[in-house]
């Protein structure tokens, strides 16, 4: 087992800094993903005028992006740790198909798009270990996801650009809400 340099493995002690707690590490993971989203949004906004567009409603009809609602127990009023954690994990699982869609949408940020996708998978792993009620978490149907992906990829260029913008914006909002909620847990 890894121990700080020069210490005996029979007596594991922390190095100069304390070992990361579950809450600290989850917090860092979300901030890592948010930094990745910022990098991707930069490319999206530079490439097209989607970030200032007022025609978002047109594309939003095709999307069913996860959103935090009052009933999810993640807001300060009516906060419920267990309900909220289930919502966060379920929402992240639902976002995975949209993150898959993003994989071919970036020219100069291909590696960053992959990092956002993979770091989200890692975050799900961390949160699932934290959750007590894993039975309440519904995993999206792979067949439904596959047909949604096909549908999104068949859109015209303008709608694809708008979809990319909306996914990044919604995912950012969802993660920010999750971060606030998890800090109360």
């Amino acid at each position: 087992a890894p121990v700080p340099p020069g210490e005996d493995s029979k007596d594991v002690a922390a190095p100069h800094r304390q070992p990361l707690t579950s809450s600290e590490r989850i917090d860092k993971q979300i901030r890592y993903i948010l930094d990745g989203i910022s990098a991707l949004r930069k490319e999206t906004c530079n490439k097209s005028n989607m970030c200032e567009s007022s025609k978002e409603a047109l594309a939003e009809n095709n999307l069913n992006l996860p959103k935090m609602a009052e009933k999810d127990g993640c807001f300060q009023s009516g906060f419920n740790e267990e309900t909220c954690l289930v919502k966060i994990i379920t929402g992240l699982l639902e976002f995975e198909v949209y993150l898959e869609y993003l994989q071919n949408r970036f020219e100069s940020s291909e590696e960053q798009a992959r990092a956002v996708q993979m770091s989200t998978k890692v975050l799900i792993q961390f949160l699932q270990k934290k959750a007590k009620n894993l039975d309440a978490i519904t995993t999206p149907d792979p067949t439904t996801n596959a047909s949604l992906l096909t549908k999104l990829q068949a859109q015209n260029q303008w709608l694809q650009d708008m979809t990319t913008h909306l996914i990044l914006r919604s995912f950012k909002e969802f993660l920010q809400s999750s971060l606030r909620a998890l800090r109360q847990m």
């Epitope: 087992a1 890894p2 121990v3 700080p4 594991v12 002690a13 922390a14 190095p15 100069h16 800094r17 070992p19 990361l20 579950s22 590490r25 860092k28 993971q29 890592y32 930094d35 990745g36 990098a39 960053q112 992959r114 990092a115 993979m118 770091s119 998978k121 890692v122 792993q125 961390f126 270990k129």
Partner: nanobody
Framework: GGGLVQPGGSLRLSCAAS????????VGWFRQAPGKEREGISC????????YYADSVKGRFTISRDYAKSTVSLQMNSLKPEDTGVYYC????????????????????????WDQGTQVTVSS
């Protein structure tokens, strides 16, 4: 664990942690051959699971994480006599800033925790 293996053989090293959760840390594997400097041979990040291999082990060694067991393993195939040495696993937090450089992971100063090492001997 380590041990004696014949050239061309395989061995799997596993790294677990005591007193903290390995899942939350980037993990690197290092080795020290007799009379040589310690060298970084492979690593895996904790943030996005990127992996890195030194040229000397590329295509023969595979690093992986197991979240169920909170371990990181190094699968070593097609072993050569020059793979002989003491193998160490180390854990650190060098990967928590988006855009980190994965190839920098083989610098031993990047790690906070080290294990005591396990001897691997490749000989017929």
């Amino acid at each position: 664990g380590g041990g004696l293996v014949q050239p061309g053989g395989s061995l799997r090293l596993s790294c677990a942690a005591s007193g903290f959760t390995l899942d939350y840390y980037a993990v690197g594997w290092f080795r020290q051959a007799p009379g040589k400097e310690r060298e970084g041979i492979s690593c895996i990040s904790s943030s996005d699971l990127k992996t890195y291999y030194a040229d000397s082990v590329k295509g023969r060694f595979t690093i992986s994480r197991d979240y169920a067991k909170s371990t990181v393993s190094l699968q070593m195939n097609s072993l050569k006599p020059e793979d002989t040495g003491v193998y160490y696993c180390a854990a650190g937090t060098w990967d928590l800033k988006f855009g980190y450089n994965i190839s920098a992971c083989v610098g031993s100063y990047e790690y906070d925790y080290w294990d005591q090492g396990t001897q691997v001997t490749v000989s017929s």
